[in-house]
């Protein structure tokens, strides 16, 4: 049951994370005008990965798309690529994980196949989350660099009457959405990988009949068996099974299974 819960939770967390990555990628507020020097501005600039916008104090908002591809900074292109790769991997991961869910029966799919699919989707979610976090972090780093450069420019070369005050940009909402979403996708992926360990037993449960020399009594217990000979100590080469009423999920038990989450 715990494995199913872990897998289901991992799926849901990853789903929310990927939805967040998509939202962040589409958002216009990756960078917003720094209002430190002028908190009441008549023109508020903000920029996304695909277009830049202006919200006028008159109440109107106008956006202009980046219609050039070659003219854009390489870093922006890299961020776009990372976010798109993250979305694609995440989407494929979601598709795979749907079929891997224990609560969904598809034909006579083996548990080992489900375990493999769970692991695959988990790895995809982890890479997807890392891509998103990397993309957002690269953009944030770019912003910080530009911020301090424009601050330096602001306080130099002001001898003339005309001040060409550069618009400084700071972190926009999309960055925080991206970081959180990437983190959730990553956590979801880790949970899927943990669930995979529970789905695929490391050793096979051999439920075959154990043959012994005649004359020895064999005691059976429900749910498996503990073969015990009359001699009592000859268990060296035998698999010992606990015959308690245990669910299929919990055949393998890892005491620290939930420490990873």
């Amino acid at each position: 049951m715990a494995v199913t819960a872990c897998q289901g939770l991992g799926f849901v967390v990853s789903l929310i994370g990927i939805a967040g990555i998509i939202a962040a990628t589409c958002m216009d507020q990756w960078s917003t005008q720094d209002l430190y020097n002028n908190p009441v501005t008549a023109v508020f600039n903000y920029q996304g990965l695909w277009r830049s916008c202006v919200r006028e104090s008159s109440g109107f908002t106008e956006c202009r798309g980046y219609f050039t591809l070659l003219g854009l900074p390489a870093m922006l292109q890299a961020v776009r690529a990372l976010m798109i790769v993250g979305i694609v991997l995440g989407a494929i991961g979601l598709l795979v994980s749907i079929f891997a869910l224990k609560c969904i029966r598809i034909g006579s799919m083996e548990d080992s196949a489900k375990a493999n699919m769970t692991l695959t989707s988990g790895i995809m979610f982890i890479v997807s989350g890392l891509c998103a976090i990397a993309g957002v972090s690269v953009f944030a780093n770019m912003l910080v660099t530009n911020f301090w450069m424009s601050t330096a420019n602001m306080y130099t070369g002001m001898g003339g009457m005309v001040q060409t005050v550069q618009t400084r940009y700071t972190f926009g909402a999309a960055l925080f959405v991206g970081w959180v979403a990437g983190g959730l996708t990553l956590i979801g992926g880790v949970m899927m990988c943990i669930a995979c360990r529970g789905l695929a037993p490391e050793e096979t449960n051999y439920k075959a009949v154990s043959y012994h020399a005649s004359g020895h009594s064999v005691a059976y217990k429900p749910g498996g068996f503990k073969a015990s000979t009359g001699f009592g100590s000859n268990t060296k080469n035998k698999k010992i099974y606990d015959g308690g009423a245990r669910t299929e999920d919990e055949v393998q038990s890892y005491p620290s299974k939930h420490d990873y989450v």
Epitope: A42, F44, Q47, E56, S57, S58, F60, E62, T164, V165
Partner: antibody, heavy 118, light 113 residues
Amino acid sequence: QVQLVQSGAEVKKPGSSVKVSCKASGYAFSNYWMNWVRQAPGQGLEWMGQIYPGSGDTKYSGKFQSRVTITADKSTNTAYMELSSLRSEDTAVYYCARFYYGNVMDYWGQGTLVTVSS
Amino acid sequence: DIVLTQSPDSLAVSLGERATINCKSSQTLLSGGNQKNYLTWYQQKPGQPPKLLIYWASTRESGVPDRFSGSGSGTDFTLTISSLQAEDLAVYYCQQGYSYPLTFGQGTKLEIK
């Protein structure tokens, strides 16, 4: 069509207050900022402040911050500008003007002459 | 505050001739978000309120004759009347909508020579 009709001319004593009204018609009054601009005789234009009737938000020029109060009544589509502690240099024509796309003042009232004289 | 300085203070031009008025800003009026300059030109005839002519430095308001044109970017702007007509006798003001407080130039009086 958009129309802004202002109240009539006023003569005031120094130290008193004046309240000028601006009745809007022909557009959604609550959805646009309303500016107040003044022009002293033979002088240029001077922005005083603005109000967003939908929320009552206001922005004022630092020069008038302590003396001007801009209000709006959505039920009558009317904006008001009250200037207190009047002095002779406040003698001017006061205009209301709608704030529009591009941060421009596209429609103006006919103006209200306020004369401050002892 | 952004200071707008117009030049000249007054200008006398013959009918049919070109008139040019300049407006210089103490700060850039170019918005990075939409690459537009938040500079507006108004015309004020005696005894009338100002009338919007040009916004975003170069976009003509509907109904404004095409002899009026605006140009410039950043801090330097120009209003040009290509062929002066008698009805163009007025005072012309530039106004910035980039930053609060909103400010106007001191005005340029256009007279017929």
